[in-house]
Amino acid sequence: NWVNVISDLKKIEDLIQSMHIDATLYTESDVHPSCKVTAMKCFLLELQVISHESGDTDIHDTVENLIILANNILSSNGNITESGCKECEELEEKNIKEFLQSFVHIVQMFINTS
């Protein structure tokens, strides 16, 4: 469930602190409820960037688990189509710390509406 996704995000945050990854990531910091699935997709795609750049087994495994969890939760809700949402590339680029904070916020949005 989404609580496990948050604990994975916390774990990624802890793992990243011991590294120096300077990447900036497309970040949706003001998610509209009607675009939350699209925003989630962008967050997950950018997480893969973190995984790739870190080259770290623990980060890789945690990112993969997080994506598996999110996929399964969202697929159980059926196909959700959203329109008029921003493309990932249109989002503001932010550092990893801000990116992860915004990610936690969107997950909390899913928790509050489930």
């Epitope: 997709k41 997950l44 893969q48 623990d58």
Partner: antibody, heavy 122, light 112 residues
């Protein structure tokens, strides 16, 4: 050439336990997730379990969840499947398979062992 | 759970002729990141399964180019352009977009 060699199969009574092993060689074991897949006699393939590269994350179908445990020892290049509370329907050839994960180009079980037969019968 | 349904279950083919196997999923297997994790495996008689195709249409190394994969969403196809004797066996589609990962029932290809 990538090699995966399963062992530990055999005859076991219903309710009994068995531990399968899969010895990996000719690749960096810790760089890959691993899976177990089984095949009942004359039947199709069934996914049984997957474990992440570091071993922290495991995944199972409901048919084995709570009874089977996948684990690994990266220092020994070995994958395990602990099978408890075995049932007649668990009778199958058990294959271990190397799993390519998405960050490295998509999911797939790209190399398989020869399998080990588990027979659950009284 | 995602149910994978293959057809036909038995496929008699003349050597040198094309063959086609269909695989349908009970729901879309496009994951949230836009990837479709659909593979095809071949199991020759008495042998272990072997990876042919991954991510719908990518041929695994060493797989002859007479094998091709296509499809999207819920409908997928494995095609063999000209069947050879060594192609005899059972072919399985498999989805690992969503846990639990699931195989199709298998299609047995035999020579007429």
């Amino acid at each position: 050439e990538v090699q995966l060699v399963e062992s530990g199969g055999g005859l076991v009574q219903p309710g009994g336990s068995l531990r399968l092993s899969c010895a990996a060689s000719e690749f960096t074991f810790s760089n890959y997730a691993m899976s177990w897949v089984r095949q009942a006699p004359g039947k199709g393939l069934e996914w049984v379990a997957t474990i992440s590269r570091g071993g922290d994350y495991t995944y199972y179908p409901d048919s084995v969840k709570g009874r089977f445990t996948i684990s690994r020892d990266n220092s020994k290049n070995t994958l395990y499947l602990q099978m408890n509370s075995l049932r007649a329907e668990d009778t199958a050839v058990y294959y271990c398979a190397r799993r390519v994960s998405m960050i490295t180009g998509g999911y797939a079980m790209d190399y398989w062992g020869q399998g080990t037969l588990v027979t659950v019968s009284s | 759970d995602v149910v994978m349904t293959q057809s036909p279950l038995s496929l008699p083919v003349t050597l040198g002729q094309p063959a086609s196997i269909s695989c349908r999923s009970s729901q879309s297997i496009v994951d949230i990141t836009g990837n479709t994790y659909l593979e095809w495996y071949q199991q020759r008689p008495g042998q272990s399964p072997r990876l042919l195709i991954y991510k719908v249409f990518n041929r695994f190394s060493g797989v002859p180019d007479r094998f091709s994969g296509s499809g999207s969403g819920t409908d997928f196809t494995l095609k063999i352009s000209r069947v050879e004797a060594e192609d005899v066996g059972v072919y399985y589609c498999f989805q690992d977009s969503f846990v639990p990962y699931t195989f199709g029932q298998g299609t047995k290809l035999e020579i007429k």
